[in-house]
Amino acid sequence: SDKLYQRKEPVISSVHTKVKGIAEVTENVTEGGVTKLGHSIFDTADYTFPLQGNSFFVMTNYVKSEGQVQTLCPEYPRRGAQCSSDRRCKKGWMDPQSKGIQTGRCVPYDKTRKTCEVSAWCPTEEEKEAPRPALLRSAENFTVLIKNNIHFPGHNYTTRNILPTMNGSCTFHKTWDPQCSIFRLGDIFQEAGENFTEVAVQGGIMGIEIYWDCNLDSWSHHCRPRYSFRRLDDKNMDESFVPGYNFRYAKYYKENNVEKRTLIKAFGIRFDILVFGTGGKF
Amino acid sequence: SDKLYQRKEPVISSVHTKVKGIAEVTENVTEGGVTKLGHSIFDTADYTFPLQGNSFFVMTNYVKSEGQVQTLCPEYPRRGAQCSSDRRCKKGWMDPQSKGIQTGRCVPYDKTRKTCEVSAWCPTEEEKEAPRPALLRSAENFTVLIKNNIHFPGHNYTTRNILPTMNGSCTFHKTWDPQCSIFRLGDIFQEAGENFTEVAVQGGIMGIEIYWDCNLDSWSHHCRPRYSFRRLDDKNMDESFVPGYNFRYAKYYKENNVEKRTLIKAFGIRFDILVFGTGGKF
Amino acid sequence: SDKLYQRKEPVISSVHTKVKGIAEVTENVTEGGVTKLGHSIFDTADYTFPLQGNSFFVMTNYVKSEGQVQTLCPEYPRRGAQCSSDRRCKKGWMDPQSKGIQTGRCVPYDKTRKTCEVSAWCPTEEEKEAPRPALLRSAENFTVLIKNNIHFPGHNYTTRNILPTMNGSCTFHKTWDPQCSIFRLGDIFQEAGENFTEVAVQGGIMGIEIYWDCNLDSWSHHCRPRYSFRRLDDKNMDESFVPGYNFRYAKYYKENNVEKRTLIKAFGIRFDILVFGTGGKF
């Protein structure tokens, strides 16, 4: 509450997160023209990335383009990209939607469709829908430990959200355990009024707000965090503004002296930890 | 403007960026002693990195040291590093400028020069100039979509820079489209009074400032962002303080049961998105 | 000092860091059942990661699990994980402490112990102590250059911590050179009253606070940074809350048509650069 006689100071904050959990992923894998059931286990090293600061990312879905190599190939026949003759293809043209540079030739993509030939990582990425349900939908049961150290330099006061009395096997609950700093990802979504299973398909951004309203006067000292959750990406966003949350990364390797890559389009939840508040003292 | 009767509150912000574009890179490639012209396509997975938070990086230039292996070799003969006898080389010495630990021997680097032998990733990185013009100079035409969600918790008010009415094929322009949040990288530099082609060689840091000056009173409500741009690194910086922006990373692999790496010195532009402002309410 | 007549404004800040140094690492390496002494050199590309923003990480220790592959194997026999019959193992069960999913069978881990068989990255990670002393303990002698650009938009004032008059071969010292922005990592720890050698084993988080108290009135202008250091992680933290600072990442490769990975548990120091302060003007 506002105590107007107090000298207020904004919080200086440092955050450290640790995600726990494993996911079982079952998907169809094609090798040598044969499609079979692939089953794999993903642990933290597979679905999260070494990140700094006030964010962490959990991959919940992905699309792989394996064995790409730099060469010439027909571009992907997305809406408006098909051609019937070379006139439709402009040598040196880079379509921002495409993944390569046109050679000026119109070539067969498959038995029924022709597209402009491009110099690119080939075969070009298929613009297919993210798998539904999400491959790592079980990430809903992962947990994250959040450690938050705060400082009010003007008041020379430091504290943290984890106290020595806390129990490391707790799980945050708004009513029963509001000071526990281990959060089940599914619970975060539930608190924010969002459906994890749905968001996991395309990805999204979730805010974890930590509010410190600190009264540092000795006679009525109080300084504990209050956690709240809200979705930060726009779920109603138009296609052209790239809904959800995804990014592409590549694993490079050499085969028969040719550099190849596997391109991974990773969908997932980016969690932003937003720490704010003030410390007041007479 | 300052309305002194209002209760002001700083903005809580979350940012999401998405870079688009492909670059055609032509460079001399030496294989088996033969130098030929190499041509390759770089897409987002090749020139940017999965990053969190209020920064994104676009690689505009690079120097590669291929096939390095842990062994003994002469260090690079940079200024002051040459030797004529073992006396000049001190066993166990690590020169901060060097990339290895001296063995105490002075050995031939090439036909004319001798340097101290080091235990290092060999052959050691040549300290050559960044290619000029920059290899990915066409990154000037890349675009970045910036999504910014802001919150004034005390006023319980949330908004974002992208409105449902916006057009996903727009490009920001200070006069014609100051609310569009898709920016051409070259335009950002032009607005900041900088030359992209020049900065792309050594790299640099560019600030994209998003200023929210929000009046949250219902009778005169206003809350839209204002974008401005300024260069954050010091272009006049002394050599000793490492001008530009670059970092080294490695790709590791095994060949004939020996661990090898390709070292990449990546030069590029780091874009820092600096969100600030206040929300005022009576 | 507080000048109540002044209009105060919080600082907008951008940070760029550059770490220098090489480490010599000696460790026991087992190949084909034979253990021998391994010796390697780590440079910046090996011990740090391309990071954005106000943090940088220096790896000081690690534990490797080489040649893991997705298959079935006995889980690691940590406290409470051993079994004597299949009844103790539940098909489909994922123990949050374990790294896999149980098949329901109890199988020999070694000659004396049995544990539940799991589908996982195998062999599962051994839960062994971090090496002591830390493998990259010599990181104490690494240096970091910190460049900080600050802006008070309301006062239209910009400056940076590095001035043209500064000497690029300086090292920060609280008394002798308090404006030098090149810091020896060991000195940072000493200033914070911490033991680098000790923290390097398990890792930790160190705060570098840069305080700008700027008087922007022309008649008594002053705007230079003041550096201070404090440890941000809790060194007395209970085991259950994951003391220190570490994360796992993996290097993937193919061998004999099977995807394999080397899992690295990296311990190290995350340095958080916390910039704060105000600019005041009449």
């Epitope: 079979k36 059931l37 089953h39 | - | 298959t71 079935l72 098949t103 589908s119 195998c122 099977v258």
Partner: nanobody, 120 residues
């Protein structure tokens, strides 16, 4: 129906070499650990060598340095290269594989055995 089919056994002189192979056929999800066991007349079946899906190997002391186990994950086949054979290596050699028919449905499978006879 999953089957393990062995081949390569026979009669050989002491000091000679043989190469056993064993292929898994049928419909299954994944071949995990594979191994070779042997049983000499009047004795218990004993482990000769095993190999994980990640190519980690383990040998009985009596064959270490003489025998080499390897596998081909494309063909789901395990091999045993036996050099410097001794009369005491005479036995019926059995192939073993731990195979998942479906996800988390592992079973142990054995081959029918192949005779190796080392004459002095």
């Amino acid at each position: 129906e999953v089957q393990l089919v062995e081949s390569g056994g026979g009669l050989v002189q002491a000091g000679g070499s043989l190469r056993l192979s064993c292929a898994a056929s049928g419909s299954f999800f994944r071949v995990n650990n594979m191994a070779w066991y042997r049983q000499a007349p009047g004795k218990q079946r004993e482990l000769v060598a095993d190999i994980t899906r990640g190519d980690r190997t383990n040998y009985a002391d009596s064959v270490n340095g003489r025998f080499t186990i390897s596998r081909d994950n494309v063909r789901n086949t395990v091999y045993l290269q036996m050099n410097g054979l001794k009369p005491e290596d005479t036995a019926v050699y059995y192939c073993y594989a731990r195979i998942e028919l479906g996800v988390l449905e592992p079973r142990d499978y054995w081959g029918q055995g192949t005779q190796v006879t080392v004459s002095s």
